[in-house]
């Protein structure tokens, strides 16, 4: 698959590559842009090419079938006849389809493809598609973009996080009028540089929730968790005590006192992670340093546990609200009014209890609101319309507000019952003080670097102080990693 | 009418280097619609393309996966012919070497003619 | 690379019958497809290119039809001549390939 030059040279790689002389694409309708394909991601991208004021031209092995699908205002022809009426052509066929291309080189020689392709799995081939493809026409300028757009979003116009194309290519020229096209095609290029970044480009589509995948499997472990602890607690144990059957309480008992504590650990995770980060930065007096693998991993997941955190809180409260409407709770309601006639009791109030179970789901609504105050603004298009400032008032002060206001809310929940043995049954504790295990530990950590003496050292460190100690030590091995300024959560 | 006359040694001793000349008549080397191949045929691997020379204002040589570190094609314009070069054979390059032309207006077609073959052995 | 496949190995037929040969590419070769016709001690001799487009000199009995991946080669009434080895071979994607052959001999 080698090409051996052995006569005649490609044009100058600095030269104007588009027609009319145009340096770089800054009038579309003046340019002509080669699409090579008929698939939908081509009719998409043509679609797009054309609202934008381009001329498209259809390279296809069939006009004549394929020029059905396109508007007329496409010139449907042979790939022969796309390739010499333009200087930028989209290569939007599969990868195994490249080499029957082969026979055209001559014709794209000092020519931009733009190679659109993905892959069925992640690192599928040894090299990237681009890669390969830059392998078959060495002559022709390859620049990777536009793959981890899908049609749909092409068609209708990009939108949030589909307006991101990241573009690479060895040729700087090249790049930057792919770059340019982007622009005018309403995304948002991200240059990745070389083609080397291609394999990286080519992965990015294909990974099914990468950040999610810890968040999810550490939600589904606590949850699991603390679904069994309430059932041994308040079902096995009953059972066991006096054979009473509590099973009825599974459905939604038992998942209701799971949905909150699990919900409250994920938010206390967020936080906890940057306060790690803290100590770390405070332990080693550097920001310089940086984070081990695994924190590193942790930070990056905050949006995720935080929105995760926020799905469990929401589902307790429809759970919450759905508590009354169930047949056993009638029953119970009409058995204690019963016992209560039998006792001969006129008045069952007790103030205490009306003011807790105020109190707790006053505090919880509250905690609701701030949390979904917090998920609205993890949306890229909500967040982009904030400041940093804004964004991390709203992520980290008012996110601390929500982890205090929560924890309030269980305690208030748990009230006085922490302290009397017969919640202990199996002496083991009550959900609720599992639940506050947690948050207690970040609402003390945020304290601690709250005070002046370590609040103070932690701005000089975020400002680029540095120990003299590890000054000393050189910094052998360590690569700058600088932490955001204040911990966001999602 | 095209004709393809091929001359060569038809022994060759393993790691030796094998030469092929293949000498065009009624077409030209240089051809901006034509593409001058080498194919081998053996009993054990069938008929093989070995690859393809071309013109279109510079030089084009494709060369198949499997023999691409030991092949060269040379044009040679001033005597109309293409010469094949495989180093390094062994005894598995024993077979019938043919040159052969493609048709080729942008695109790839037969081989519409033939050269009339050399058997080249590998043997010591 | 395309693998192409021929059946069958080898066809028994008398002279005056009709001979079909079938070839199959692994994946889609459009109807850049080609068959050749090659007799002991000689050169490949292109016959049918294009799928279905006989070549320069080749009589009407033989004929080609088929495209993406099945290609079937007739020969209507088999002639003493015709008895050889085909061959088929794609040429739209690279590398170009052969197929193993089909023997037509005597019945």
């Known amino acids: 698959m080698e090409s051996i030059s052995m006569m005649g040279s490609p044009k100058s790689l600095s030269e104007t590559f588009l027609p009319n002389g145009i340096n770089g694409i800054k009038d579309a309708r003046k340019v002509t842009v080669g699409v090579i394909g008929s698939g939908d991601f081509a009719k998409s991208l043509t679609i797009r090419l054309i609202r934008c004021g381009y001329h498209v031209v259809i390279g296809s092995r069939n006009p004549k079938f394929a020029s059905e699908f396109f508007p007329h205002v496409v010139d449907v022809t042979h790939h022969e006849d796309a390739l010499t009426k333009t200087n930028i052509i989209f290569v939007a066929i599969h990868r195994e389809h490249y080499t029957s291309l082969w026979d055209l080189r001559h014709l794209l020689v000092g020519k931009i493809l733009i190679d659109v392709s993905n892959n069925m799995r992640i690192n599928q081939y040894p090299e990237s598609n681009a890669e390969y493809l830059a392998s078959l026409f060495p002559d022709s300028l390859i620049v990777k973009g536009f793959n981890v757009v899908s049609a749909w979003a092409l068609q209708l116009g990009p939108k949030d996080a589909s307006r991101q194309v990241y573009i690479c290519s060895n040729n700087i020229q090249a790049r930057q009028q792919v770059i340019e096209l982007a622009r005018q095609l309403n995304f948002i290029p991200i240059d990745l540089g070389s083609l080397s970044s291609a394999r990286e480009i080519e992965n990015l589509p294909l990974r099914l929730f990468t950040l999610w995948r810890g968040p999810v499997v550490v939600a589904i472990s606590l949850a699991t968790f603390f679904f069994l602890y309430s059932f041994v607690r308040d079902v096995i144990h009953p059972y066991a005590r006096n054979q009473q059957s509590d099973f009825y309480k599974i459905p939604i008992e038992i998942v209701n006192k799971t949905l909150p504590i699990v919900a409250i650990t994920l938010l206390s995770l967020v936080y906890l992670a940057g306060l790690l980060a803290a100590a770390y930065q405070l332990y080693y007096g550097t920001k310089y340093r940086r984070f081990p693998p695994w924190l590193e991993t942790w930070l990056q997941c905050r949006k995720q546990l935080g929105l995760l955190s926020f799905f469990f809180a929401m589902v307790h409260v429809a759970y919450s609200l759905c508590l009354p409407m169930r047949r056993s709770e009638r029953y119970l309601f009409l058995n204690m009014a019963y016992q209560q006639v039998h006792a001969n009791i006129e008045n069952s109030w007790n103030e205490e209890e009306v003011w807790r179970i105020e109190m707790y789901i006053s505090f919880g609504i509250m905690s609701l609101g701030l949390l979904s105050l917090l998920a609205v603004t993890s949306i890229p298009s909500v967040s982009n319309a904030l400041n940093w400032r804004e964004f991390s008032f709203i992520q980290s002060t008012l996110g601390y507000v929500a982890l205090l206001i929560s924890t309030f809310h269980v305690l208030i929940y748990g009230w006085k019952r922490a302290f009397e043995e017969e919640y202990y049954r199996f002496y083991t504790p009550p959900n609720f003080v599992l639940a506050l295990v947690l948050p207690s530990i970040v609402i003390l950590g945020k304290i601690i670097l709250f005070l002046p003496c370590i609040s103070r050292k932690l701005k000089r460190i975020k400002k680029g102080w540095e120990k003299s100690q590890f000054l000393e030590e050189g910094m052998g091995g360590t690569i700058p990693h600088v932490s955001p300024e204040r911990v966001t959560v999602m | 009418q095209v004709q393809l006359q091929q001359s060569g040694p038809g022994l060759v001793k393993p790691s030796q280097t094998l030469s092929l000349t293949c000498a065009i008549s009624?077409?030209?080397?240089?051809?901006?619609?034509?593409?001058w191949n080498w194919i081998r045929q053996s009993p054990s691997r069938g008929l093989e393309w070995l690859g393809r020379?071309?013109?279109?204002?510079?030089?084009?040589?494709d060369y198949v996966v499997s023999v691409k570190s030991r092949i060269i094609f040379n044009p040679d314009t001033s005597k109309n012919q293409f010469s094949l070069q495989l180093n390094s054979v062994t005894p598995e390059d024993t077979a019938v070497y043919y040159c052969a032309r493609v048709r080729q207006d942008y695109r790839s077609g037969p081989f519409d003619y033939w050269g009339q073959g050399t058997l080249v052995t590998v043997s010591s | 690379e395309i693998v192409m496949t021929q059946s069958p190995v080898t066809l028994s037929v008398s002279p005056g019958e009709r001979a079909t040969l079938s070839c199959w590419a692994s994946?889609?070769?459009?109807?850049?497809l080609a068959w050749y016709q090659q007799k002991p001690g000689q050169a490949p001799r292109l016959l049918i290119y294009?799928?279905?487009t006989r070549a320069t000199g080749i009589p009407a009995r033989f004929s080609g039809s088929g495209s993406g991946t099945g290609f079937t080669l007739t020969i209507s009434s088999l002639q003493s001549e015709d008895f050889a080895v085909y061959y088929c071979q794609q040429y739209n994607n690279w590398p170009f390939t052969f197929g193993p052959g089909t023997k037509v001999d005597i019945k």
């Open positions: 020379t071309y013109y279109r204002s510079k030089w084009y040589n």
């Open positions: 009624g077409d030209s080397v240089s051809s901006n619609s034509a593409a």
């Open positions: 994946q889609s070769v459009s109807s850049s």
């Open positions: 294009g799928a279905s």
